[in-house]
């Protein structure tokens, strides 16, 4: 279930975790049902709060993603402190509305209070039904 | 369903602008992609541009770049292609359809776009 993510930030992340994605195959994202993520990140700063953002970007068009909850603290326990690792486990309710497509670039980012935490580009996904 | 109707289109000279317009009969802002396609006769339907819902990003086709300029109105439920340096290439018939992947139910009628001298 380990997927290969490019890091967009300075190598925090440790793994990528999605069920039933594997390395750098196509990883896909089902309309109207739920998808699941699992990452672990090592925190490069002290931080109390810790947000989500995720853009996806579909046949190269950047679009919103929405139902996402960006506190990332309802799915870790913050504070973080500096050098240590944390498991975040996050699910997305894809809604049924979705864009279909097979080219789909997705890039999740973790902020901390002084910036960047943890930021990762998934570029093998694709929605379908 | 959602019906959408394109209107806007005409005869106009190489050089000239047109402004087309693409009314839906429903909210589109739940849409998170919309696009403008065209069709000459004997080619394949192509994409001319698309625009996301809520942040307004948009994506055009290399022919059309610096030309046209797509844009939508939630609360109005309409989309607009603006069509400025139009040029004989652009004669098409355009529609309107949800990006990326178009739903045949959605293809209305188009709108006829002719440049010509």
């Known amino acids: 279930d380990q997927v290969d993510v490019k890091d967009c930030a300075n190598h925090e992340i440790k793994k990528v975790l999605v069920p039933g994605c594997h390395g750098s195959e196509p990883c896909i994202i089902h309309r109207g049902k739920p998808f699941q993520l699992e990452a672990v990140f090592e925190a490069n700063q002290n931080t109390k709060t810790a947000k989500i953002e995720i853009k996806a970007s579909i046949d190269g068009l950047e679009v919103d993603v929405p139902g996402i909850d960006p506190n990332a603290c309802h799915y870790m326990k913050c504070p973080l402190v500096k050098g240590q690792q944390y498991d975040i486990k996050y699910t997305w309710n894809v809604p049924k509305i979705a864009p279909k497509s097979e080219n789909v670039v997705v890039t999740v980012k973790v902020m901390g209070d002084d910036g960047v935490l943890a930021c990762a580009i998934a570029t093998h996904a694709k929605i379908r039904d | 369903q959602v019906q959408l109707v394109e209107s806007g289109g005409g005869l106009v000279q190489p050089g000239g602008s047109l402004r087309l317009s693409c009314a839906a009969s429903r909210s589109i802002d739940r849409f998170p992609a919309m696009g403008w396609y065209r069709q000459a006769p004997g080619k394949k339907r192509e994409l001319v541009a698309a625009i996301s819902s809520a942040n307004t990003r948009t994506k055009y086709a290399d022919s059309v770049k610096g030309r046209f300029t797509i844009s939508r109105d939630n609360a109005e439920n309409t989309m607009y292609l603006q069509m400025n340096s139009l040029k004989p290439e652009d004669t098409a018939v355009y529609y309107c359809?949800?990006?990326?992947?178009?739903?045949?139910?959605?293809w209305g009628q188009g709108t006829q776009v002719t440049v010509s001298s």
């Open positions: 359809n949800v990006f990326p992947r178009p739903v045949q139910g959605y």
